[in-house]
């Protein structure tokens, strides 16, 4: 696309509410976009007393808040639902909370895939 940013064509997909919403629970999502618009991946999660509950992952539309972010980093201090977005294929596999006000960085790794 000539602007130097990482192109996003596929993201990790996840929906914790998949049964009610009748979607897939997890997988890969191919991102479809309009010409001249950037695409991103996102992750959203809750943190209940240190226990991470993944909410959703997938593709995200052109959003200046996500530009040139190779890693998915949430910066809000203590939201009900954390959100991060990034550019580059599958960049939402790992996600991090790094509050702007300072404090410890917490990175969440996906669980290892069981061998088939």
């Amino acid at each position: 696309s000539g602007r130097g940013e990482a192109e996003t064509r596929e993201c990790i997909y996840y929906n914790a509410n998949w049964e009610l919403e009748r979607t897939n629970q997890s997988g890969l999502e191919r991102c479809e976009g309009e010409q001249d618009k950037r695409l991103h991946c996102y992750a959203s999660w809750r943190n209940s007393s240190g226990t991470i509950e993944l909410v959703k992952k997938g593709c995200w539309l052109d959003d200046f808040n996500c530009y040139d972010r190779q890693e998915c980093v949430a910066t809000e201090e203590n939201p009900q639902v954390y959100f991060c977005c990034c550019e580059g294929n599958f960049c939402n596999e790992r996600f991090t909370h790094l509050p702007e006000a300072g404090g410890p960085e917490v990175t969440y790794e996906p669980p290892p895939t069981a061998p088939t």
Partner: antibody
Framework: EVQLLESGGGLVQPGGSLRLYCAAS????????MSWVRQAPGKGLEWVSA????????YYADSVKGRFTISRDNSKNTLYLQMNSLRAEDTAVYYC????????????WGQGTLVTVSS | DIQMTQSPSSLSASVGDRVTITCRAS??????LNWYQQKPGKAPKLLIY???VLQSGVPSRFSGSGSGTDFTLTISSLQPEDFATYYC?????????FGGGTKVEIK
């Protein structure tokens, strides 16, 4: 230019059926999820139903579940809403709208078609 | 379902005024919040998505902010063409819900 054109609205008696159509042009129809949203006279917007780009996944508001069926024909660039067991409270302007990738917003809307349920 | 509550339901303002509309979700919806404008007899038009991202062609006097459950649409200097009804909508759940709308009228 993206265009969505609804048709099929009209006057129907309570308990009757109606099929709405939304003809799409100006974009790759099968790449987009599509929704129906309605607006009763003088009231706000109410989301009714949605369907994935492939047509495999469908979603319904509780108020229409079991009575309305959303479907699409990507070869004809057309979205449908089959409405059965219609009630007076279904009277509204029905809009079709496109959605790129959930959780994207509804970025283009048709001009709407009026459905009136009355005896 | 996620309930969306908008306030006020209507307001009167003059050209040049700063106008603020609020939207509250019944549960945390992160950044999955969109705003629409509707004029009488017309289809809704997308203004803002992802809380704060202006849709192409929308004037910069419109802005959005907030997170979690509380969100705001601001018009920094109201123009004659801005008199309309504004709706918030959540896309956190595939079962979309809209706020009840805020009608912006001429004072």
């Amino acid at each position: 230019e993206v265009q969505l054109l609804e048709s099929g609205g009209g006057l129907v008696q309570p308990g009757g059926s109606l099929r709405l159509y939304c003809a799409a042009s100006g974009f790759t129809f099968g790449a987009y999820a599509m929704s129906w949203v309605r607006q009763a006279p003088g009231k706000g917007l109410e989301w009714v139903s949605a369907i994935s780009g492939s047509g495999d996944d469908t979603y319904y508001a509780d108020s229409v579940k079991g009575r309305f069926t959303i479907s699409r024909d990507n070869s004809k660039n057309t979205l449908y809403l089959q409405m059965n067991s219609l009630r007076a409270e279904d009277t509204a302007v029905y809009y079709c709208a496109r959605q790129l990738i959930p959780p994207a917003p509804l970025d283009y809307w048709g001009q709407g078609t009026l459905v009136t349920v009355s005896s | 379902d996620i309930q969306m509550t908008q306030s006020p339901s209507s307001l009167s303002a003059s050209v040049g005024d700063r106008v603020t509309i609020t939207c509250r979700a019944s549960q945390g919806i992160s950044r999955f919040l969109n705003w629409y404008q509707q004029k009488p007899g017309k289809a809704p038009k997308l203004l803002i998505y992802g809380v704060s991202v202006l849709q192409s062609g929308v004037p910069s006097r419109f802005s959005g902010s907030g997170s979690g459950t509380d969100f705001t649409l601001t018009i920094s200097s109201l123009q004659p063409e801005d008199f309309a009804t504004y709706y918030c909508q959540q896309s956190f759940s595939s079962l979309f819900t809209f706020g009840g709308g805020t009608k912006v009228e001429i004072k």
